[in-house]
């Protein structure tokens, strides 16, 4: 039996460190300190990346893509940190690197792993084409590819198509859903599992509502408490279909505060807003507003869709003027 | 004083394995790093590796990986190296040597030799 | 991995000469370098490290210079005990690599 004072060598030790795009990280190194130190990162064993030694920084031999990105926490070298900061990391950073620190009695190898995710907020856009209707769930850019899946009324569908394009760093992914006809709501749920970050969109469709011309019409907007967090920023916007596109009528921002409101008609209850319910009247309905209404409530971990079709049919008066 | 005494001379056939011993004294054994280096009859120093008592990763040459396995048992202030799958080019002294990136202290060497 | 190339592999020198050996880094080593001697039979003994601190207890006719890629070894009175072979090394970095070594003997 080993006494417990004894170990094997390990070549070196291992860590992994995850990073975002263009954000700064850090490389964790730490040795016994003493005197003397020199302290050397590399990428891939054989690319320079940061140079220290007799108490300064030697980067003339620093490859040119760390130039001035790179730094060590001076004023802990004493105390042991080899730590180096690391700025605006992007995706051809990803890799093993290497920190050797020598001292006048230790020599100590550590070597760390860097992954880099790019996660850009996802959107869910609700469109019309022709007779069909579709909702698409889309992100810009990710790294590395997502997890995308659909549920209908809290079931997963198995259908899942994925329109994917890849640049040089990263996927821009479309997931679109053809609903044409359906009643049922619809959850789309984006997953970066290297970031652990997860994005849901969720789309709900209100029974149609028919009111007469002159009347008033209230939209409910409430968000779902499983996704909602009030302490999160988030906007809500208010939009009416019109043939094929949308136009925005009116828009609050969580941040801020703010309303901004680009129809007269709309009339927003700041005493709701406060309790997190973004229901909205339209007043004196003409022919014209007869169309889908759309609120919007999304930050960075959701997107929450409902739409209300609206009717506005001719009043009494009007038709028999005609 | 500082003091490193290795095991004795062997002899070894090729495929076979090797352990040489480096008892220390005179010195706080988990501060320094111990390396190993050989050296070829009639050639030049070759570093192996190090390894740290204390833990932290150590450093090794490439070219013995997979090959050399280097241990400790601080309760004895000794550290260890065991070179595998020897070739009559392994034939040489191995030195222990402590310190960081220079070596301070020396054993006296352990001649292992290889010959079928 | 850095290359040591050491000059001369021998020479022939008299008690009381100046003895200097040159010892060229294959890349700029930021005078991480360090000098030992070693005697037949035995292990080496560190005389100098970064590139010109004598070791406790080496005497003051051992010294060392140089910068960049380029180091030398000076004994600038040679004595009956200096006879033996010199390796330089940089500590610059890992694998730490030796010169070939240098045999200083008697003429």
């Known amino acids: 039996i080993f006494p417990l004072a004894f170990f094997i060598y390990v070549p070196m030790n291992e860590q992994i460190v995850i990073g975002r795009l263009d954000e700064d990280i850090i490389l964790p190194s730490s040795f016994e300190r003493g005197s003397e130190v020199v302290i050397h990162w590399k990428y891939q064993d054989s690319y320079k990346v940061h140079s220290y030694y007799k108490g300064s920084d030697h980067l003339e031999s620093q490859d040119p893509r760390y130039a001035n990105r790179t730094s060590l926490f001076y004023n802990e070298i004493q105390n042991g940190n080899a730590s180096l900061f690391f700025r605006r990391v992007s995706l051809l950073d990803e890799g093993i690197y290497t920190c050797y620190v020598g001292t006048a009695i230790q020599v100590i190898t550590n070597k760390v792993v860097l992954k880099v995710g790019v996660f850009l907020t996802p959107v869910m856009k609700y469109e019309k084409r022709n007779t069909n209707s579709f909702l698409i769930c889309s992100v810009l850019s990710v790294y590395p590819r997502p997890i995308i899946t659909w549920k209908m009324d809290n079931t997963p569908i198995s259908e899942n198509n994925m329109e994917e394009t890849g640049s040089l760093d990263s996927f821009s992914i479309n997931s679109p859903l053809n609903i044409t006809g359906s009643n049922s709501s619809y959850e789309c749920t984006i997953e970066n599992s290297l970031l652990k970050q997860t994005w849901t969109g969720r789309w709900t469709m209100k029974d149609g509502l028919h009111k007469m011309q002159s009347e008033h019409v209230s939209l409910s907007c409430q968000p779902v408490n499983d996704y909602f967090s009030p302490n999160q920023d988030f906007k809500v916007t208010w939009s009416r279909m019109k043939s094929g596109t949308f136009s925005v009528l009116a828009y609050y921002l969580s941040s801020s505060q703010n309303t901004i409101i680009n129809e007269s008609r709309f009339s927003w209850n700041k005493e709701l807003i406060n309790q997190s319910d973004f229901s909205m009247n339209l007043m004196d309905l003409n022919l014209s507003d007869s169309g889908e209404y759309l609120c919007n409530i999304s930050s960075d971990e959701y997107t929450l869709l409902t739409i209300h079709t609206v009717h506005v049919e001719p009043s009494q008066e009007t038709a028999s003027h005609n | 004083q500082v003091q490193l005494v290795q095991s004795g001379a062997e002899v070894k056939k090729p495929g076979a394995s090797v352990k040489v011993s480096c008892k220390t004294s005179g010195y706080t054994f988990t501060e320094y790093t111990m390396h190993w280096v050989r050296q070829a009859p009639g050639q030049g120093l070759e570093w192996m590796g190090g390894i740290n008592p204390n833990n932290y990763g150590a450093p090794y040459n490439q070219k013995f990986k997979g090959r050399v396995t280097m241990t400790v048992d601080t309760s004895i202030s000794t550290a260890y190296m065991e070179l595998s799958r020897l070739r009559s080019d392994d034939t040489a002294v191995y030195y222990c040597?402590?310190?960081?990136?220079?070596?301070?202290?020396w054993g006296q060497g352990t001649l292992v030799t290889v010959s079928s | 991995d850095i290359q040591m190339t050491q000059s001369p592999s021998s020479l022939s020198a008299s008690v009381g000469d100046r003895v200097t050996i040159t010892c060229k880094a294959s890349q700029d080593v930021g005078t991480a370098v360090a000098w030992y001697q070693q005697k037949p039979g035995k292990a080496p003994k560190l005389l100098i490290y970064?590139?010109?601190t004598r070791h406790t207890g080496v005497p003051s006719r051992f010294s060392g210079s140089g910068s960049g890629t380029d180091y030398t070894l000076t004994i600038s009175s040679l004595q009956p005990e200096d006879f033996a072979t010199y390796y330089c090394?940089?500590?610059?970095?890992?694998?730490?690599?030796f010169g070939q070594g240098t045999k200083v003997e008697i003429k």
């Open positions: 970064w590139a010109f």
């Open positions: 090394q940089q500590h610059y970095d890992t694998p730490f690599t």
């Open positions: 040597a402590s310190g960081g990136y220079y070596f301070d202290y």
